[in-house]
Amino acid sequence: REPTVQCGSETGPSPEWMLQHDLIPGDLRDLRVEPVTTSVATGDYSILMNVSWVLRADASIRLLKATKICVTGKSNFQSYSCVRCNYTEAFQTQTRPSGGKWTFSYIGFPVELNTVYFIGAHNIPNANMNEDGPSMSVNFTSPGCLDHIMKYKKKCVKAGSLWDPNITACKKNEETVEVNFTTTPLGNRYMALIQHSTIIGFSQVFEPHQKKQTRASVVIPVTGDSEGATVQLTPYFPTCGSDCIRHKGTVVLCPQTGVPFPLDNNKSKPGGWLP
C-alpha cells in the first residue's frame, strides 16, 4: 500500500526531539502554499491554506515517520499553530510507483484577511537537541477584501467590497468641484477628498436615507486647480470604521449643461484596514 498522511494538531515539541538519532531523513524538496475556499454552515465560506510538500527522493526517506508544519500569522495580532502529519506506511520506494516524487498536502490552517504567514516544515525524526536540522519555510500573504475571492466573504461585503459608488466629479468653476456618487445601505457617512499632489478640498457627507441606495451630490470648495485631480471617497461603515475600502475618481471639466461627467468610476483603493 502507498503511504498517505494522517494529520493532527501538535502544539509542543515532537517527542522524537527528546531522543538521540544517529541518522535522520533529509529535508523536503519543495514546500508550497495556496489558498482554497470551503463552504461553512452560515452560508459564508472560509479560506484555508493548502500546504503541499514534496519529499526528497533518496534512501533517507526510509527513516521518515512524519512531517511537522507550523504556521505563524502576523497581522493585528500574532498566531501560531502546528500540525503533525504521520505517514501511514513505511516508504518502500524513493519515488511514486507511477513516477514522480512523493507529494502530500494538508488543508486546514485558516486564513485571515490581509495577513502575512510564515509556514515552516521539517521531517521527523528531526535533528537532536541543540542541532540544526533540515527544514524548509515559505511566506504567504493572504489577500484583502479587494481580492476576487475574498470580496464575497461576509466580513468583506460588510466593509463595502461589493459596493460600487460610481463616482463622477467635475470642476464647476475655479473654486468648486461637484462630486456625485451612489450611496450604500451599509453606512450613512462619507468623506470626499480632492487631491492634486496635496489636499485641495474635502467635505463630510451625511446621507440620512441609509436603508436605500440613492445618488448623493456634494459641492466641494477647492483651493487650487482641480482639473485632473483625484477624488477619494472614504465610507464610514460600522464594521470597519475609518479604515473601509476607499474608492477613487478623477475630476473633469463639467459639461456646459452642468451635468457631471463620469470617469474612472471603478477604481478602488484599500484603506489602512483592508479587512
Epitope: 527522493a57 534512501a59 519515488t95
Partner: antibody, heavy 118, light 107 residues
Amino acid sequence: QVQLVQSGAEVKKPGASVKVSCKASGYTFISYWMNWVRQAPGQGLEWMGRIDPYDSEIQYNQKFKDRVTMTRDTSISTAYMELSRLRSDDTAVYYCARSGGFDWFAYWGQGTLVTVSS
Amino acid sequence: DIQMTQSPSSLSASVGDRVTITCRASENINSNLAWYQQKPGKAPKLLLYDVTNLADGVPSRFSGSGSGTDYTLTISSLQPEDFATYYCQHFWGPPYTFGGGTKVEIK
C-alpha cells in the same frame, strides 16, 4: 523484460564533447531514476549523476558538475549524457543504469566506450 | 562524500571454497548497500541490495550481512562462474560511491 541499449563507441579529440544515449524498454520510463556510471580501463566504478525522467530533476557528482549534462526524451524513452571539454583521462566505458526502488542499480546498459585521444 | 573501502583487493580461491569480502563505509549508511559482480568486458550485475536481498536470478550461495558501517559478502561455495570482480556500493543519498573492487581469481 527490461532493456537498456546504449549508443556505439566514440573516438574524440581532447576538448571535444561526447553525447551518449540510452534507450529504455520493458518498463515505464518515467517511474525510475536513470544513473550514469563510468569505468576507466582497469579501474573501478564511478557514479556521475542521475536524472528523474518524470520531471528532469538531476543530481550530479560534484566532480563532473561543470562538464556533464543529463537530459531525457520521454517520447522515445531515452536518456542522454553529454560530457564536454574531454580530456584523455575521460577515456572510459560509460554505462547507464536504472535504479531499483532505491538507488541500487538493477539494470545496466551494455556500456559505451569513449576514447579521448589526439 | 561517503568513502567505501573494500578488502581484500584481490584473492585466490578454489572451487567449493567459502569466500568472504568486506566493505566498510566511512559513515553509517543504514544498510543501504548493494553488491555487484562484473566479468571482463561486461556490465556489472546486481547481486544483492539492502545488504541481504538477493536480486532476481542470483543463486542462494551469495549472501550478505552487516549494518552501520561494516558489511560482508559471502559466497558459500565458490563455483567456476563466480570468478569475477565484486563491488559494493552505498545508496544512502547522492553522491553514490563504490568500493574499489575485489578480484576473485582461481588458485
